[in-house]
């Protein structure tokens, strides 16, 4: 019997530019003789419903149709037909199919590959054109993919140490697509410092598919107005 097993759940997620290994394991009732077997990997884009051959291995020869694509003949002997793709790009997301032939048998497996890019986040203080006692804090998230992102603001006071979500005076701009296919977005928080307690900690919280835990950037309101430290102004908090 010949069977192929792919990533459990049918989806693999990989970071942009990573050297990704798309898993494909072969289960065969006899020891594998790689000279009598064939492996073909196919890719089908998310946007275009046509399959393209990525890599082919047949006993006496192997050919990469995507630069750098490789299946290790050494690992193949033990049933590992996983495909390695160096420097994975956003446009390479889609369905990958591992086809295994041990003549006269043939088996297939498919997996969805999602390519994600994590946002970089930074806090900026914009004082231009602001009224007395008014500050505008900007939380810039850049270089993320896919487009869906959630940016919220929270505050913690000495009285209420648990974070409270801020819903008023928050404006999140439209997402902007970069040349490389990633996205940027800026969320703004308007504060009236005269009405806020010194020592209050504000956080910009970024949630994205590429992040295991939310990305948090914070600043503390001090008694003196506009006293955001230089690091708080420009640091990349990713």
């Amino acid at each position: 019997d010949l069977k192929v097993e792919m990533m459990a759940g049918g989806t693999q997620i990989t970071p942009l530019n990573d050297n990704v290994t798309i898993f494909c394991n072969i289960f065969y009732s006899q020891p594998l003789n790689i000279t009598s077997m064939g492996i073909t990997w196919f890719w089908k884009s998310l946007t275009f419903d046509k399959e393209v051959k990525v890599f082919e291995f047949f006993g006496d020869h192997q050919e990469a149709f995507r630069p750098g694509a490789i299946v290790s003949p050494w690992r193949l002997k033990s049933g590992d037909a996983s495909l390695r793709l160096p420097g994975i790009q956003l446009e390479e997301a889609g369905e990958y199919r591992c086809e295994v032939v041990v003549t006269p048998l043939k088996a297939q497996g498919t997996v969805q590959l999602e390519v994600v890019a994590s946002p970089a986040s930074r806090l900026l203080l914009d004082q231009v054109g602001m009224k007395e006692n008014e500050d505008k804090y900007m939380c810039e998230s850049s270089g993320f993919y896919p487009e869906a992102i959630n940016i919220t603001w929270e505050k913690q006071t000495q009285k209420f140490p648990h974070p409270i979500e801020i819903s008023e005076d928050v404006i999140t701009g439209p997402t902007i697509k970069n040349m490389d296919g990633t996205f940027n977005v800026t969320s703004c928080l308007k504060l009236n410092s005269s009405q806020e307690d010194p020592g209050t900690v504000y956080q910009c919280v970024v949630r994205h598919a590429s992040l295991h835990t939310p990305l948090r950037s914070n600043f503390t309101l001090t008694a003196a107005r506009h006293s955001l430290s230089e690091t708080e102004k420009t640091d990349n908090f990713s």
């Epitope: 010949l2 000279t35 047949f58 003549t103 043939k106 088996a107």
Partner: antibody, heavy 120, light 107 residues
């Protein structure tokens, strides 16, 4: 000219075994995989299994695993299928056929078929 | 196992008709579909492979199309010698399975 010549019709009793032969000519025997297909009551086709003469790799449909055994004799370019513990359900026409592509299993040449009748 | 459901079971035709036979796979088989013709008392004959590739010597009135689970086989202008049973087969994964057949009969 490619030819697949099968052995003649068989009339057997339930419980018996039979070995059907398929003698090939006109091509390099080891370059093609040999398959066997069952056709019952003139309509449906069922893949029984196949054998790669180069490596003696065999593969069977789960349904025929305990029913059929495929072998080859490279010296005479002949493929064989043995069917055991015959019942009336095994009465059918059996074809040998070949596939040549490395990753595709379409059957380009077929034998003339061997009619097997199992009856008490 | 992948089930190939072919329809119709039989199709009454006249010479010159355009005929379409469909085959539906129980799961995606990419484009790994084959079509055969079988005349009474004869062995099956290969007509098309990889969905749309005509085998050597097969007239261009025979065409195939489809992808994934839905496939069609068309005879643009039926001729008398086309009266036969037509079978689809998937060679996407073993065990390789066939459709139940479609019989082309005189109307």
């Amino acid at each position: 000219e490619v030819q697949l010549q099968q052995s003649g019709p068989e009339l057997l009793k339930p419980g018996a075994s039979v070995k059907i032969s398929c003698k090939t000519s006109g091509y390099t025997f080891t370059d093609y995989t040999m398959h066997w297909v069952k056709q019952s009551h003139g309509k449906s086709l069922e893949w029984i299994g196949g054998i790669n003469p180069n490596y003696d790799n065999t593969g069977y449909s789960e349904k025929f695993k305990d029913k059929a055994t495929l072998t080859v004799d490279k010296s005479s370019s002949t493929a064989y299928m043995e069917l055991r513990s015959l019942t009336s359900e095994d009465s059918a026409v059996y074809y040998c056929t070949r596939s040549g592509s490395r990753r595709s299993f379409y059957f380009d040449y077929w034998g003339q078929g061997t009619t097997l009748t199992v009856s008490s | 196992d992948i089930v190939m459901t072919q329809s119709p079971d039989s199709l009454p035709v006249s010479a010159g008709d355009r005929v379409t036979i469909t085959c539906k796979a129980s799961q995606s088989v990419s484009n790994d579909v084959v079509w055969y013709q079988q005349k009474p008392g004869q062995s099956p004959k290969l007509l098309m492979y990889s969905t749309s590739n005509r085998y050597i010597g097969v007239p261009d009135r025979f065409t195939g199309s489809g992808y994934g689970t839905d496939f069609t086989f068309t005879i643009s202008t039926v001729q008398a010698e086309d009266l036969a049973v037509y079978f689809c087969q998937q060679d996407y994964s073993s065990p390789y399975t066939f459709g139940g057949g479609t019989k082309l009969e005189i109307k």
